[in-house]
Amino acid sequence: HNTTVFQGVAGQSLQVSCPYDSMKHWGRRKAWCRQLGEKGPCQRVVSTHNLWLLSFLRRWNGSTAITDDTLGGTLTITLRNLQPHDAGLYQCQSLHGSEADTLRKVLVEVLADPLDHRDAGDLWFPGESESFEDAHVEHSISRSLLEGEIPFPPTS
């Protein structure tokens, strides 16, 4: 799976979309999980409604919401009031039994609020040494991760 980068501004909402084949994943609930380390498990953040026919209902866990257009084949995750600690690698998953298929790997980047003049030193930008010339930065922009970019922050 390629990794898609979604950039959002601190304090604002970020919307992540994960397209999928609606027929292939028919009847399957979906989930949004956070990757714990490069080879670690993916920790469930929020999942769609227990009843697949109600997957379009928005479900919240804290500041994260999920909703699924099961006919159109688009899973949408909203991260409200985006914070620096929200940055990292996530997955959109399709659930079947105890198994989970990865629909999309997502790298969330948190950009400093240009109107916030506080110290932005605690904001982490994955692969910030890499070129971002191809990314037009705006609210909820996404792009594929460039080859060589590091999806996890370097460990000190």
Epitope: G27, N50, L51, L53, L54, F56, L57, W60, D69, L71
Partner: antibody, heavy 126, light 106 residues
Framework: EVQLVESGGGLVQPGRSLRLSCTAS????????MSWFRQAPGKGLEWVGF??????????EYTASVKGRFTISRDGSKSIAYLQMNSLKTEDTAVYYC?????????????????WGQGTMVTVSS | DIQMTQSPSSLSASVGDRVTITCQAS??????LNWYQQKPGKAPKLLIY???NLETGVPSRFSGSGSGTDFTFTISSLQPEDIATYYC????????FGGGTKVEIK
């Protein structure tokens, strides 16, 4: 007039089967999610399961206590929803209602049930 | 699973009284809650959907409010025809009903 009429209830022995019907009229049946509920004598309401509209390929969902025993189906040409009940238990004794899910658009509905049938009594006893 | 605790289980009020029924969810259910009226020997009737929306054709004396875990159903001026049992129903987790509140006239 929008209407739902249930039929097929009666007295049945434990372990046997029964099929209930819910005949719809006055609305475009295929466009709506249809649900079954039950109410044991002197008790509250319990959701049994529902079946999606034609857009959702008549996908079904059930409450845990009936999963594997009850099957909901629909016949769009006759505007009928069915509840096939197998391996009946005495605790399945109840008035069974069918109901229509409230519709917002072709894709979206809400599990607020805005039209109900009059109910049909199912008694499971030896 | 979510538990819906409805209170009181029964109440007696006079015609014209303001009647309030509460429904408490065991966890946050947003506004995913409906209210129904059921008269003896009859099918339930939808009154309020999505916590606060009045169903078409339902008298305006009925209203609903709340979000999260605490919800309220109100009859602003009780009428003789309001004698019934009222149920809340959540749909955040599955489809679960409260235990019901039987409303009688004093």
């Amino acid at each position: 007039e929008v209407q739902l009429v249930e039929s097929g209830g009666g007295l049945v022995q434990p372990g046997r089967s029964l099929r209930l019907s819910c005949t719809a009229s006055g609305f475009t049946f295929d466009d709506y999610t249809m649900s079954w509920f039950r109410q044991a004598p002197g008790k509250g309401l319990e959701w049994v399961g529902f079946i999606g509209s034609k857009a959702y390929s008549a996908t079904t969902e059930y409450t845990a206590s009936v999963k594997g025993r009850f099957t909901i189906s629909r016949d769009g040409s006759k505007s009928i929803a069915y509840l096939q009940m197998n391996s009946l238990k005495t605790e399945d004794t109840a008035v069974y209602y069918c109901a229509r899910g409230k519709r917002y658009s072709y894709t979206y509905w809400t599990p607020a049930f805005d039209v109900w049938g009059q109910g049909t009594m199912v008694t499971v006893s030896s | 699973d979510i538990q819906m605790t409805q209170s009181p289980s029964s109440l007696s009020a006079s015609v014209g009284d303001r009647v309030t029924i509460t429904c408490q969810a065991s966890q946050d259910i947003t506004n995913y809650l409906n209210w129904y009226q059921q008269k003896p020997g009859k099918a339930p009737k939808l009154l309020i959907y999505d916590a606060s929306n009045l169903e078409t054709g339902v008298p305006s004396r009925f209203s609903g409010s709340g979000s999260g875990t605490d919800f309220t159903f109100t009859i602003s001026s009780l009428q003789p025809e309001d004698i019934a049992t009222y149920y809340c129903q959540e749909y955040d987790s599955y489809i679960t009903f409260g235990g019901g509140t039987k409303v009688e006239i004093k």
